[in-house]
Interface confidence: medium
């Protein structure tokens, strides 16, 4: 009889990340009697992927029911295949023997690639904001992709920009791949509503491309203007001053008014109204008792935007020309005497 | 690691005084808004008083407003909580917290100390 | 002031179940609204930022939600450690004030 034979008859197999990878393997032969054992790699450091007689391998199943006398398909199939799963597989024949068995034949060996899509892309922007006209860097990260072929465009709202660089890791032979690029956007006033996307292709994408994107909104600050406006008289002794913050990006916004250097009244920034360009306005007012100052007032419109240093306007209240009012000593409608900016 | 040890608690007569001390280390004391918070026995939470980090912003609550008086001393990593004119109902356990987001309030608490026990009682 | 209404006050429930705690605010405080788990004869500790963000480190068995006047403090699956005082906070505006605690207990 002849003697029995291995056969791999697929030199190589290409699967898909996270499908099942059928390894073929057939004996030419019942004889001699023993079992089979898949082996990852050649030589004393290989891996043991499938022991027919003992052993707990939950991701592989056998094609064939390998207990029966007359098997001889000794093919397996390997579920939920990673690119870590990628290498050369043997199918390798034992002969019963005692008390161990002993190696008889090996299969040529089928070469398992894997093809393994990108991870969604995660685009990452500075980790503190920024003011319109400065310059930012978005990182693009996709990660575990095979073959290392791939490509990378960065877009701004639709328009495909051109100030980036781009790496691929690691250089040399690996079972999967990285890609990292950064590219430079410009900030503009407008920016409150833009996208910075970038997009991945890949073999494995089957020419849908996976995009991953930044909001410009988280990114971007754009600080505020202040106009402080004195409004008709309402009633005697009483004068509303009113203080527009404009233009400003994000909503945490603080505004302190102060009279003559002292605190009067602080309030966060509520009901605000949003313009079409993704910034908000909000109006802050303060009614005056002319009465209770015997000189002019400096009024003060002081705000507090999203953590920065304080901006101020201010305007000069003439009180001069108001008649004086007796046992008045009321400035402004909630005002304290406190000092320091203490509330 | 990231650490708040408060320290000055005691025993004290209504009327009196007391000056908590709150020691940081493990972060870039400089940068944080810090928060004084305080639980009566067997009661909820109660906020006492905020300090902005350059100590520009200073907000009390009405139950302790003119009475207690927060400040902080970067230089030495240090928070403070000056108590004059204690009452009874200011007995509590004394937490300081470290804010969660640099250089701005309004975030919540992330770190907090064990505590110091101040009662006020005759 | 913003009053932060908290129920139930106090909850007991068997391991596995699943807990939800509601806070009401007196008004708008948008996401500003944190929630914290106290143990006894412990400090608090941060578990939910922003309404609905998991601090880092804190089981995913907790979560948040909700946005306005209304949100939600729910535990998936309750474990023994679980055993604490849970309390929402809001930061919309000064004072800060927090909710009057739930005590979760095991049957």
């Known amino acids: 009889e002849e003697e029995l034979q291995v056969i791999q008859p697929d030199k190589s197999v290409l699967v898909a990340a996270g499908e099942t990878a059928t390894l073929r393997c057939t004996a030419t032969s019942l004889i001699p009697v023993g079992p089979i054992q898949w082996f990852r790699g050649a030589g004393p450091g290989r891996e043991l992927i499938y022991n027919q007689k003992e052993g707990h391998f939950p991701r592989v199943t056998t094609v064939s029911d390998l207990t029966k006398r007359n098997n001889m398909d000794f093919s397996i199939r390997i579920g939920n295949i990673t690119p870590a799963d990628a290498g050369t597989y043997y199918c390798v024949k034992f002969r019963k023997g005692s008390p161990d068995d002993v190696e008889f034949k090996s299969g040529a060996g089928t070469e398992l690639s894997v093809r393994a899509k990108p991870s969604a892309p995660v685009v990452s922007g500075p980790a503190a904001r920024a003011t319109p006209q400065h310059t930012v860097s978005f990182t693009c990260e996709s990660h575990g992709f095979s073959p290392r072929d791939i490509t990378l465009k960065w877009f701004k709202n639709g328009n495909e920009l051109s100030d980036f660089q781009t790496n691929v890791d690691p250089v040399g032979e690996s079972v999967s791949y990285s890609i990292h690029s950064t590219a430079k956007v410009v900030l503009t006033r407008e920016d409150v509503h833009s996208q910075v996307i970038c997009e991945v292709a890949h073999v494995t994408l089957q020419g849908d491309p996976l995009r991953g994107t930044a909001n410009l909104s988280e990114t971007i600050r754009v600080p505020p203007t202040l106009e402080v406006t004195q409004q008709p008289v309402r009633a005697e002794n009483q004068v509303n001053v009113t203080c527009q913050v404009r233009k400003f990006y994000p909503q945490r916004l603080q505004l302190t008014w102060l009279e003559n250097g002292n605190v009067s009244r602080t309030e966060t920034a509520s009901t605000v109204t949003e313009n079409k360009d993704g910034t908000y306005n909000w109006m802050s007012w303060l009614l005056v008792n002319v009465s209770a100052h015997r000189d002019d007032v400096k009024l003060t419109c002081q705000v507090e935007h999203d953590g920065q240093p304080a901006v101020s306007k201010s305007h000069d209240l003439k009180v001069s020309a108001h008649p004086k009012e007796q046992g008045s000593n009321t400035a402004a409608e909630n005002t304290g005497s406190n000092e320091r900016n203490i509330y | 690691q990231v650490q708040l040890v408060e320290s000055g608690g005691g025993l004290v007569k209504p009327g009196g005084s007391l000056r908590l001390s709150c020691a940081a280390s493990g972060f870039t004391f400089s940068s944080y808004s810090m928060h004084w918070v305080r639980q009566a026995p067997g009661k909820g939470l109660e906020w006492v008083s905020s300090?902005?980090?350059?100590?520009?912003?200073?907000y009390y609550a009405d139950s302790v407003k003119g009475r207690f008086t927060i400040s902080r001393d970067n230089a030495k990593n240090s928070l403070y909580l000056q108590m004059d004119s204690l009452r009874a109902e200011d007995t509590a356990v004394y937490y300081c917290a470290k804010e969660r987001v640099d250089y701005w309030h309004g975030y919540g608490m992330d770190v907090w100390g064990q505590g110091t026990t101040v009662t006020v009682s005759s | 002031d913003i009053q932060m209404t908290q129920s139930p006050s106090s909850l007991s429930a068997s391991v596995g179940d699943r807990v939800t705690i509601t806070c009401q605010a007196s008004q708008d405080i948008s996401n500003y609204l944190n929630w914290y788990q106290q143990k006894p004869g412990k400090a608090p500790k941060l578990l939910i930022y922003?309404?609905?963000n998991l601090e880092t480190g804190v089981p995913s068995r907790f979560s948040g939600s909700g946005s306005g006047t209304d949100f939600t403090f729910t535990i998936s699956s309750l474990q023994p450690e679980d055993i604490a005082t849970y309390y929402c906070q809001q930061l919309s505006n000064y004072p800060i004030t927090f909710g009057g605690g739930t005590k979760v207990e095991i049957k």
């Open positions: 300090i902005s980090s350059s100590d520009s912003w200073i």
């Open positions: 922003d309404a609905s």
